[in-house]
């Protein structure tokens, strides 16, 4: 069966939303009117892992392109990245690990808590304009919230 | 008054190793992304590394990646730069700087010179 | 990498003048821009950042203006402390970049 996905947008809970910084990095900046334009539709594909009732592992693929974010050891360091793939071959159920995400939603916020490196969540910094990147701490003054807007097809 | 205060320039063989600190004050250290930018003599400025408050996020110039560390003591209001196999290219003042807003530099310290020669 | 080109790289000017010195980005960065004033023997100054936004106690004889890829700092009234060294710098995407500088010298 074809893998499900939905498309979504993506604020964290400073209400900042994700656009495209360069070709393979995104930043998280306050948007209004016009320019809520630049943020990045994600494609949301509910892959195969290991899933609870507030877990559900998810592969964020941006929308129209063949760009999913990973997450891969660069200087010995968990780090996030936007990842080229073979557009005929993904998405797919089977994702590898570094693409996979534990969707986890607690009190109507999202965290994204990478497959490959427990404990390392899709964070974004207090600060305007600055990247997403992947984050090993919760709690502190980096942001690991999120909420989902559904973009319609 | 902000005020950042740079030390561990000097002279260095070609594929030795330097470790730069910032000493910052003035204001809340912690809450602050802080630039390192470098600027060779008589030449332009050169963004070289950025680290986001809790270190979490690092970035660095690809004339400098896998060469060059960027981290901080906020206990100690410091930000280090720790190079490592220096080139004679790395010839500059170092410079600090505080993050304002969107990704200026809004303060600067007053630099410190590395000269990597033999 | 985005690519930030200044010019002129040098300009002969009096004091009083009115002068204009232009930033062109390689690709589209929104309002992301800033502008600072360089001293021989000192660390660079926050003129103005966001593209138009003048940083607290810089005069406002300095304005920048622009759009997308171009963009230009005006000095109107030029004195004789604004003889420098001026830089663009995109803070669109990492990494960094700053335009090669334009130098304001005494005509």
């Known amino acids: 069966a074809p893998v499900r996905s939905l498309n979504c947008t993506l604020r964290d809970s400073q209400q900042k939303s994700l656009v495209m910084s360069g070709p393979y990095e995104l930043k998280a900046l306050h948007l209004q009117g016009q320019d809520m334009e630049q943020q990045v539709v994600f494609s949301m594909s509910f892959v195969q892992g290991e899933e609870s009732n507030d877990k559900i592992p998810v592969a964020l693929g941006l929308k129209e392109k063949n760009l999913y974010l990973s997450c891969v050891l660069k200087d010995d360091k968990p780090t996030l990245q936007l990842e080229s793939v073979d557009p005929k071959n993904y998405p797919k159920k089977k994702m590898e690990k570094r693409f996979v995400f534990n969707k986890i939603e607690i009190n109507n916020k999202l965290e994204f808590e990478s497959a490959q490196f427990p404990n390392w969540y899709i964070s974004t910094s207090q600060a305007e304009n600055m990247p997403v990147f992947l984050g090993g701490t919760k709690g502190g003054q980096d942001i690991t919230d999120f909420t989902m807007q559904f973009v319609s097809s | 008054e902000v005020q950042l205060l740079e030390s561990g320039g000097g002279l260095v063989q070609p594929g030795g190793s330097l470790r730069l600190s910032c000493a910052a004050s003035?204001?809340?250290?912690?809450?602050?992304?802080m630039f390192w930018v470098r600027q060779a003599p008589g030449k332009g400025l050169e963004w070289v590394s950025v680290?986001?408050?809790?270190?979490?996020?690092?970035r660095y110039a690809d004339s400098v990646k896998g060469r060059f560390t960027i981290s901080r003591d906020n206990s100690k209001n410091t930000l280090y730069l720790q190079m490592n196999s220096l080139r004679a290219e790395d010839t500059a003042v170092y410079y600090c700087?505080?993050?304002?807003?969107?990704?200026?530099?809004?303060?600067w310290g007053q630099g410190t010179l590395v000269t990597v020669s033999s | 990498d985005i690519q930030m080109t200044q010019s002129p790289s040098s300009v002969s000017a009096s004091v009083g003048d009115r002068l204009t010195i232009i930033c062109r980005a390689s690709q589209d960065i929104n309002r992301w821009l800033a502008w600072y004033q360089q001293t021989p023997g000192n660390a660079p100054k926050l003129l103005i950042h966001?593209?138009?936004s003048l940083q607290s106690g810089v005069p406002s004889r300095f304005s920048g203006s622009g759009s997308g890829t171009d963009f230009t700092l005006t000095i109107n009234s030029l004195q004789p402390e604004d003889f420098a060294t001026y830089y663009c710098q995109q803070a669109d995407s990492f990494p960094l970049t700053f335009g090669g500088g334009t130098k304001v010298e005494i005509k």
């Open positions: 700087a505080r993050v304002g807003y969107g990704g200026n530099s809004d303060y």
């Open positions: 003035g204001f809340t250290f912690s809450k602050y992304f």
């Open positions: 680290i986001s408050p809790s270190g979490g996020m690092t």
């Open positions: 966001s593209l138009t």
